[in-house]
Amino acid sequence: KIDACKRGDVTVKPSHVILLGSTVNITCSLKPRQGCFHYSRRNKLILYKFDRRINFHHGHSLNSQVTGLPLGTTLFVCKLACINSDEIQICGAEIFVGVAPEQPQNLSCIQKGEQGTVACTWERGRDTHLYTEYTLQLSGPKNLTWQKQCKDIYCDYLDFGINLTPESPESNFTAKVTAVNSLGSSSSLPSTFTFLDIVRPLPPWDIRIKFQKASVSRCTLYWRDEGLVLLNRLRYRPSNSRLWNMVNVTKAKGRHDLLDLKPFTEYEFQISSKLHLYKGSWSDWSESLRAQTPEEEPTGMLDVWYMKRHIDYSRQQISLFWKNLSVSEARGKILHYQVTLQELTGGKAMTQNITGHTSWTTVIPRTGNWAVAVSAANSKGSSLPTRINIMNLCEAGLLAPRQVSANSEGMDNILVTWQPPRKDPSAVQEYVVEWRELHPGGDTQVPLNWLRSRPYNVSALISENIKSYICYEIRVYALSGDQGGCSSILGNSKHKAPLSGPHINAITEEKGSILISWNSIPVQEQMGCLLHYRIYWKERDSNSQPQLCEIPYRVSQNSHPINSLQPRVTYVLWMTALTAAGESSHGNEREFCLQGKAN
């Protein structure tokens, strides 16, 4: 009922709570002497559904049959209208339209941990739109029945708030949930389980790892578990991997030896627990333990290469280069590299430890036979040394690879191809392809890159440290015993026309011809490998086409003579540079007038 209803009553038949689709009769009746003063037959009773007028009647009462009410709550209000006055509220009623509860489905119960509480979930089915009470009931041994009621409006979860104990782990319990509202009731199918079925252990905790004698091969994982745990599963992986290694263990009692861990690797470990071989469920995975395994002495051998440079008649410079061991070979933090240089006939040896670099340069006599050995050391020991004899890598002309070419192969790759040397190709033990950025000064500080190729290969794709629009000097070495032959070529992965032309810095006259000198184009403006320079000239103030001279590009060249100029004529000269992609813009213009006689 709404408000005090002093003036009259609203009654609802058959009930204030009805099934969707049902019809209700609503009666509004005035109490004695509560109609319009003096004109009781003028009483006009009006029935409102919310704010909408749906019926009216003159007299002391009004009857209305209402159908098609929607799910939920509908408010009806009865008002009295008298002549010359506002409508007066008489009384009202709420009608609740809903449905009987559907059978709850998929009832399932779980207890999280041996000390946890039993909680059950289910699916309610469609909304009843009415106050519906859910009662969760659990029947167990000793003829006992536990139950709890749900006070929430949408109830699909209930926690008993108490704990099942393992005193009879195989005893059966049967759960059932019953939904009741004004229109009916329905119970779920029973769900029967034992303690072992519903207790989901807490994840293991306090996970630790120990390496006996700081060795990766003697590793034990320790953890703590709830008392009844029978099974564990362990998973572990290197921190940079997505794939887990899995191990199942029974009656581990909080420890397990791991035998297949890699040295000097950060691993992530997790553990899960279960109470019974085939009953119940696995716990959540424990929090991760992250731990680094100890170092072991390096395996594998360094890949070493070298470069020789003539200094003078008695001395030569040797630059040694080596590549870092892979993580799996280094098996620890490399603390230093040990380089030993030995003159093989005299037996003199010099050893040096190098930290922070993967190269070493020294000066040795040009006489004698020299060998080097390089090894990598971590806290546990050293790798096997890589030994190489220092020789003149390009001395054997007959071992030089033939028809070397370098072609761009996609983004930042160069495909180098060659033909075996003329000399017996089967004598080749391996090819080495070496590349470095081309610097006009022949700078020895420019990083050197190399890769080794099997003797039956006649191509190699180079991609390491290759940048677009940079020219590389590429050498292919064929090695056979203590001999080597080489061929070289320039190559780039991507090219375009140079951004500028050479800058003419001087023009000098020599015996009737001129010598033009220029500054090299800065490397970053060359935009690939230069193929040619062009020198252009024309008479000043002339509109004729310029003449030109094309010079093949050579790294060290920066001057060229021209002998086809007329004396006492002023010429304008300029230069351009070309890559395979095209010609640069003009360099600077210089004027020159030849004084002497033409040849």
């Epitope: 509480t117 039993v118 659990l138 167990g140 000793k142 006992l144 536990w146 139950q147 709890k148 009621q149 926690d159 008993f160 708030g161 108490i162 704990n163 099942l164 104990t165 005193e167």
Partner: nanobody, 125 residues
Framework: QVQLQESGGGSVQAGGSLRLSCAVS????????MGWFRQAPGKEREFVAA???????VYPNSVKGRITISRDNAKNAVDLQMNALKPEDTAVYYC???????????????????WGQGTQVTVSS
């Protein structure tokens, strides 16, 4: 100090009803499990009903549907409504209180720390 005092016992005809009450002082009933036990002459004390601190009720199947346990936090009391009484319900009824958090423990006498003196219920045929 904790005290439990039962009331509401008496004589009643078979089929009748009684409402027993247990008033508690010294501890809030909302924080504890509350139980009712009974002992008939010459028999062992037996479990009748209990209510956990989390509002889970437990009954033996022999009384389920006839007996209801409820808590009145405002009065710091627990009630036992008994309907359709039978002569075999004749016994001294005891109220008990304890910090019990397990299903099985709610029906076990030795889990309850505090006990009342009991109230007599007699059902005649």
């Amino acid at each position: 100090q904790v005290q439990l005092q039962e009331s509401g016992g008496g004589s009643v005809q078979a089929g009748g009803s009684l409402r027993l009450s247990c008033a508690v002082s010294g501890r809030p009933v909302s924080d504890y499990a509350m139980g009712w036990f009974r002992q008939a002459p010459g028999k062992e004390r037996e479990f009748v009903a209990a209510l956990s601190a989390s509002d889970t009720t437990v009954y033996p199947n022999s009384v389920k549907g006839r007996i209801t346990i409820s808590r009145d936090n405002a009065k710091n009391a627990v009630d036992l409504q008994m309907n359709a009484l039978k002569p075999e319900d004749t016994a001294v009824y005891y109220c008990a209180m304890g910090p019990i958090g397990t299903f099985q423990g709610l029906a076990r006498q030795n889990e309850y720390h505090y006990w009342g003196q009991g109230t007599q219920v007699t059902v005649s045929s």
